[in-house]
């Protein structure tokens, strides 16, 4: 019995659902009562899901798997794995037994996009040409391990004096911290590129350093110039710092975080005490670092509604403030492609190809192209609809007249994460059915 699975690994984003395709060719007169189907982990032989005695025996894998019961009779033995985790990565074997027996293994490659890197400088004031500074680039919650590259303003790679560390959290997602030590010239731009090798996603940030004397006077409050980009559901740090003078004590400090536009109080520290979160109990300061001038705010379990500008007010004897922007993002799922009509297609037929990608933020950019990468701009209709959490589902429809054969690709781009998700369909010249029959 020939059992067919994809040659390439199935790539699934953490938290999304994945389909492990498996198919066989049922003979005439085949009934489900004859079918024994077992999915198991290839290495450990742990049972994942099974179908026997004409019945779905259910999930043996954390209740996160399902078959496609309506499609089994046509030979579709695919497995749906829900809410993918890093720990799911690996090989799954599909065993099919009717009268004969066959099996094949499919690989699941788990991935998660890295956040836009945040950059910090140490020291971060009174910088002069010739000073050595440490630039730290941090990017969070990605998988698998990242590749980190540094370059200057001309794009020239910076490979000396770089130390990169990657640490996995309890979910197996990596936080990457890369440190570049440089001696300052008259001025310079330093860029950190964090690449997810599986998603082929590049996240980058830059810092331009112009050494000069800091002005004296009011409290100088420093925040990042670029928006802080945070993935929905993760934690974000809104960085804010000031320079305490000698003899400074926390009893002198008044720190207030508020929403810039509405002036809604978010968090405060006054009278030597943390007054706590006034923002849905999802904020925290870094109490151990306040005395060193670190007034940063931690925002937990970021939601789309959190997007916007936050102002950090610092008052000691003098007063200063600065606003930092929070840009919320969520990666789009790999697009699914459907054809209408999807049977007996011939050159000259008009077909409607629909590309759907889910639960991203902000709104996506959608591009269509042919097999040569030539953009297809005519007869495209794209709609985007936000759900209750503010995440967008995108549906793009392309109408084309079939040539002898052709590949049509849909690219869904998250402009903030610089994440490209794509799906393709290849239509051949002969009369055909989509999806191709096993």
């Amino acid at each position: 019995l020939e059992v067919q699975v994809p040659e390439d690994p199935v790539v699934a984003l953490v938290g999304t659902d994945a389909t492990l395709c498996c198919s066989f060719s049922p003979e005439p007169g085949f009934s489900l009562a004859q079918l024994n189907l077992i999915w198991q982990l290839t290495d450990t032989k742990q049972l994942v899901h099974s179908f026997a005695e004409g019945q779905d025996q259910g999930s043996a894998y954390a209740n996160r798997t399902a078959l496609f019961p309506d499609l089994l009779a046509q030979g579709n033995a695919s497995l749906r794995l829900q809410r993918v985790r890093v720990a799911d990565e690996g090989s799954f074997t599909c065993f099919v037994s009717i009268r004969d027996f066959g099996s094949a293994a499919v690989s699941l490659q788990v991935a998660a996009p890295y956040s836009k890197p945040s950059m910090t400088l140490e020291p971060n004031k009174d910088l002069r040409p010739g000073d050595t500074v440490t630039i730290t680039c941090s990017s969070y919650q990605g998988y698998p391990e990242a590749e980190v590259f540094w370059q200057d303003g001309q794009g020239v790679p910076l490979t000396g004096n770089v130390t990169t560390s990657q640490m996995a959290n309890e979910q197996g997602l990596f936080d990457v911290h890369s440190i570049l030590r440089v001696v300052l010239g008259a001025n310079g731009t330093y860029s950190c590129l964090v690449r997810n090798p599986v998603l082929q996603q590049d996240a980058h940030s830059s810092v331009t350093i112009t050494p000069q004397r800091s002005p004296t006077g009011a409290v100088e409050v420093q925040v990042p110039e670029d928006p802080v980009v945070a993935l929905v559901g993760t934690d974000a740090t809104l960085r804010c710092s000031f320079s305490p003078e000698p003899g400074f004590s926390l009893a002198q400090l008044n720190l207030i975080w508020q929403l810039t536009d509405t002036k809604q109080l978010v968090h405060s520290f006054t009278e030597g005490r943390d007054q706590g979160s006034a923002y849905a109990n999802r904020t925290a300061l870094f109490p151990d670092l306040l005395a060193q001038g670190n007034a940063s705010l931690r925002l937990q379990r970021v939601r789309v509604a959190d997007e916007g500008s936050f102002t950090c007010f610092v008052s000691i004897r003098d007063f200063g403030s600065a606003a930092v922007s929070l840009q919320v993002a969520a990666p789009y799922s790999k697009p699914s492609m459907t054809l209408e009509p999807n049977k007996d297609l011939r050159p000259g037929d008009t077909v409607t190809i629909t590309c759907s990608s889910y639960r991203g933020y902000p709104e996506a950019e959608v591009f269509w192209q042919d097999g040569q990468g030539v953009p297809l701009t005519g007869n495209v209709t794209t709609s985007q609809m936000a759900n209750e959490q503010g995440l967008f589902d995108v549906h793009s429809v392309l109408r084309v007249v079939l040539g002898a054969n052709g590949t049509y690709s849909c690219l869904v781009r998250n402009p903030v994460l610089q994440q490209d998700a794509h799906g393709s369909v290849t239509i051949t010249g002969q009369p055909m059915t989509f999806p191709p029959e096993a």
């Epitope: 001309q154 794009g155 790679p157 490979t159 860029s191």
Partner: antibody, heavy 122, light 106 residues
């Protein structure tokens, strides 16, 4: 459509200098760096250096320091390369080339000028 | 600087034949890039980030490799593939090219 239009062929005497231009169109000049590449007759490609039109920052291949000077004119979206103290070894085709992206790992040159042929001869 | 050594320097292939050329780096590089150049023309980007085909490149081309060893493969040679192919790296400064592999039609 992105285009890099280089100046025409040059025949110069040894010891002289020459300035080759690369006029760009079809994209925002300051958003991409510009590289220069040398190809001697029947030979491989050699990287000369790169300039960031946004701030004029340059990086040169050590081999071409003192030989080549890269400049830009933002108002006309044109990049220039001046070659000085010319010898017969400098006879070659010189290309300007734009990389796909500055802030991604796409470090390939996806647009090239048509090349400027320089002949150094007495 | 990182030296890229391409081999063979010259090769010929018949239509339909499988072709493989290599590019060896003197030190490890993160990614390799390939260009195709035909006589009296500028180089064209062919493969980027080791294995991705540039726009318009036929699917019979593929790229692979890691570390110090990279290759470009044509699954089935066609007449239009006759050209010189150069590899390039910029993982380390200065940017360098290989000496090229000239592919001729047999």
């Amino acid at each position: 459509e992105v285009q890099l239009q280089q100046s025409g062929p040059e025949l110069v005497k040894p010891g002289a200098s020459v300035k080759i231009s690369c006029k760009t169109s079809g994209y925002t000049f300051t958003e991409y760096t510009m590289h220069w590449v040398k190809q001697s007759h029947g030979k491989s490609l050699e990287w000369i250096g790169v300039i960031n039109p946004n701030n004029g920052g340059t990086t040169y291949n050590q081999k071409f320091k003192g030989k080549a000077t890269l400049t830009v004119d933002k108002s006309s979206s044109t990049a220039y390369m001046e070659l000085r103290s010319l010898t017969s070894e400098d006879s070659a085709v010189y290309y300007c080339a734009r990389p796909h992206s500055l802030l991604r790992l796409r470090r390939e040159f996806d647009y090239w000028g048509q090349g400027t042929t320089l002949t150094v001869s007495s | 600087q990182i030296v890229l050594t391409q081999s063979p320097a010259l090769m010929s292939a018949s239509p339909g034949e499988k072709v493989t050329m290599t590019c060896s780096a003197s030190s490890s590089v993160s990614y390799m890039y390939w260009y195709q150049q035909k006589p009296r023309s500028s180089p064209k980007p062919w493969i980027y980030l080791t294995s991705n085909l540039a726009s318009g490149v036929p699917a019979r081309f593929s790229g692979s490799g890691s570390g110090t060893s990279y290759s470009l493969t044509i699954s089935s040679m066609e007449a239009e593939d006759a050209a010189t192919y150069y590899c390039q790296q910029w993982s380390s400064n200065p940017l360098t090219f290989g000496a090229g592999t000239k592919l001729e039609l047999k």
